[in-house]
Amino acid sequence: MMTGTIETTGNISAEKGGSIILQCHLSSTTAQVTQVNWEQQDQLLAICNADLGWHISPSFKDRVAPGPGLGLTLQSLTVNDTGEYFCIYHTYPDGTYTGRIFLEVLESSVAEHGARFQIP
């Protein structure tokens, strides 16, 4: 019986060009976490195997960094990064637990844009 629950950072937003940390936490189970996969819609971004470590997809290696912990850091964000992200926990003996995060990447703030211009 699967008793665990995944807590995530939920719906989050970040500025274009910035970074964001995606975090999930599995609780309420004694199951052994054997691997955590991070996915964006239909693409696998990274794998963190409990024994054999982190592996970032070549398609994302320039903009994705492992950690902290079992989390994932997305860098140099673009508006195209807006969307759903999933943390998939492979566990023994429970099986698979999935958490969902929605990321919205926003254009730089009005205040930031305004600071670039001098008032005559």
Epitope: D42, L44, N49, G53, Y92
Partner: antibody, heavy 119, light 107 residues
Framework: EVKLQESGGGLVQPGGSLKLSCAAS????????MSWVRQNPDKRLELVAT????????YYPDSVKGRFTISRDNAKNTLYLQMSSLKSEDTAMYYC????????????WGQGTLVTVSS | DIVMTQAHKFMSTSGGDRVSITCKAS??????VSWYQQKPGQSPKLLIY???TRHTGVPDRFTGSGSGTDYTLTISSVQAEDLALYYC?????????FGGGTKLEIK
């Protein structure tokens, strides 16, 4: 040059035990997770055990869980596989293997040691 | 566990031919696939990882492709030294499982 050298294989009776060793050299052994992969007489490959870099985490598939124990001695640069309650279906060539750096695949393999379980 | 099926246990080809070795996963493994070559009397050797990334030193006649559940290793111009067993492996979920192997024979 990365080198992995297995030893300890041999003929053992069903129900018996055997301990395999893998001597590692050419890399910082204590920085890498390690694995044992076996190849049965039909040439099928199976990952039978993994261990993290400090020995604090291990994983086994159901086929060997409770019978096999993977361990390591980082001071001796050696990986071990203790096998007990052996069955005829455990007959195989046993390889010690390591992933490549930044490579999702076993880039380094030993030459293997043959385990035969038979009465 | 994810089952990796290599439908062809044997494939026969002539030198210089193009050959494609296929592997089908029992569920979507999202390109977390590697390919190995094992020559007679030797240990397996990594050819391809992440479905299409060629490992260091692997000749460019070896190409990996695929997505979802279907993956292919293509040898563009088979050489005599390519006589070997070829295996796929998935890394998407534990335990990481291998296909049953395809033996490439040269006519």
């Amino acid at each position: 040059e990365v080198k992995l050298q297995e030893s300890g294989g041999g003929l053992v009776q069903p129900g018996g035990s055997l301990k395999l060793s893998c001597a590692a050299s050419g890399f910082t052994f204590s920085s890498y997770g390690m694995s044992w992969v076996r190849q049965n007489p039909d040439k099928r490959l199976e990952l039978v055990a993994t261990i993290n870099s400090n020995g604090g985490s291990t994983y086994y598939p159901d086929s060997v869980k409770g019978r096999f124990t993977i361990s390591r001695d980082n001071a001796k640069n050696t990986l071990y596989l203790q096998m007990s309650s052996l069955k005829s279906e455990d007959t195989a060539m046993y390889y010690c293997a390591r992933l490549g750096t930044g490579t999702l695949g076993f880039a380094y393999w030993g030459q293997g040691t043959l385990v035969t379980v038979s009465s | 566990d994810i089952v990796m099926t290599q439908a062809h246990k044997f494939m026969s080809t002539s030198g210089g031919d193009r050959v494609s070795i296929t592997c089908k996963a029992s569920q979507d493994v999202k390109t977390a696939v590697s390919w190995y070559q094992q020559k007679p009397g030797q240990s397996p050797k990594l050819l391809i990882y992440w479905a299409s990334t060629r490992h260091t030193g692997v000749p460019d006649r070896f190409t990996g492709s695929g997505s979802g559940t279907d993956y292919t290793l293509t040898i563009s111009s088979v050489q005599a030294e390519d006589l070997a067993l070829y295996y796929c492996q998935q890394h998407y979920s534990t335990p990481w499982t291998f296909g049953g192997g395809t033996k490439l024979e040269i006519k």
